[in-house]
């Protein structure tokens, strides 16, 4: 029964599995982008580095009306351990350019995979 | 239905200056963040600047830092991009743009040609 019951209601998800996820939703709108992602909306391009996860989550809230990104508005936020809302930016985001979110998805989405085999998963 | 409406474009030779304008109706303008952006022939869209709500914060693309200013009159939903020191390289169709909304609430933009 114990088992049973950890079956039915599992612990919080690796980190390891959270990132492959991200990873495989970042993959998913790239592929899949016919029209220009988000309509070619700008947003502040981050520094892929230390708090990483929140200032990608700081730019990419401000984008409303783009269903295509809010799956991974919702991941990232599991990956920041603060609440980040709309128009919030952190001493670490430093605001020098915008670029496409066509390009942030792609930028982010190479970062990620090189974490990834380099098995930096948090 | 918000609408962004761009003037002020034209031909200048190199060194000279623009004032380029942006009215805005259809949404409260005082509330949001705005860009310019630009597209020069063949090439993709660029961000120029941005201005925060109060307009209080400016933010500039390192190829027009120190030589364009941005701002915006919010008692008449204005947005401005005064353009001075003017390069060939700044030849494009400028667009004012209400920010993260994407080219669907973009204006139709104004045309800068710098040449001499």
């Known amino acids: 029964l114990t088992c049973l019951g950890g079956f039915a209601s599992p612990g919080p998800v690796p980190p390891s599995t959270a990132l492959r996820e991200l990873i495989e939703e970042l993959v998913n709108i790239t592929q899949n982008q016919k029209a220009p992602l988000c309509n070619g909306s700008m947003v502040w391009s981050i520094n892929l580095t230390a708090g990483m996860y929140c200032a990608a989550l700081e730019s990419l809230i401000n984008v409303s009306g783009c269903s295509a990104i809010e799956k991974t508005q919702r991941m990232l936020s599991g990956f920041c351990p603060h609440k980040v809302s709309a128009g919030q930016f952190s001493s670490l985001h430093v605001r020098d350019t915008k670029i496409e979110v066509a390009q942030f998805v792609k930028d982010l989405l190479l970062h990620l995979k090189k974490l990834f085999r380099e098995g930096q998963f948090n | 239905e918000v609408q962004l409406l761009e003037s002020g474009g034209g031909l200048v030779q190199p060194g000279g200056s623009l004032r380029l304008s942006c009215a805005a109706s259809g949404f409260t303008f005082r509330d949001y963040e705005m860009d310019w952006v630009r597209q020069a022939p063949g090439k993709g869209r660029e961000w120029v600047s941005s201005i925060g709500p109060s307009g209080s914060e400016t933010w500039y693309a390192d190829s027009v830092k120190g030589r364009f200013t941005i701002s915006r009159d919010n008692s008449k939903n204005t947005l401005y991009l005064q353009m001075n020191s003017l390069r060939a390289e700044d030849t494009a169709v400028y667009y004012c743009?209400?920010?993260?909304?994407?080219?669907?609430?973009w204006g139709q933009g104004t045309l800068v040609t710098v040449s001499s």
């Open positions: 743009a209400k920010a993260y909304t994407g080219f669907g609430y």
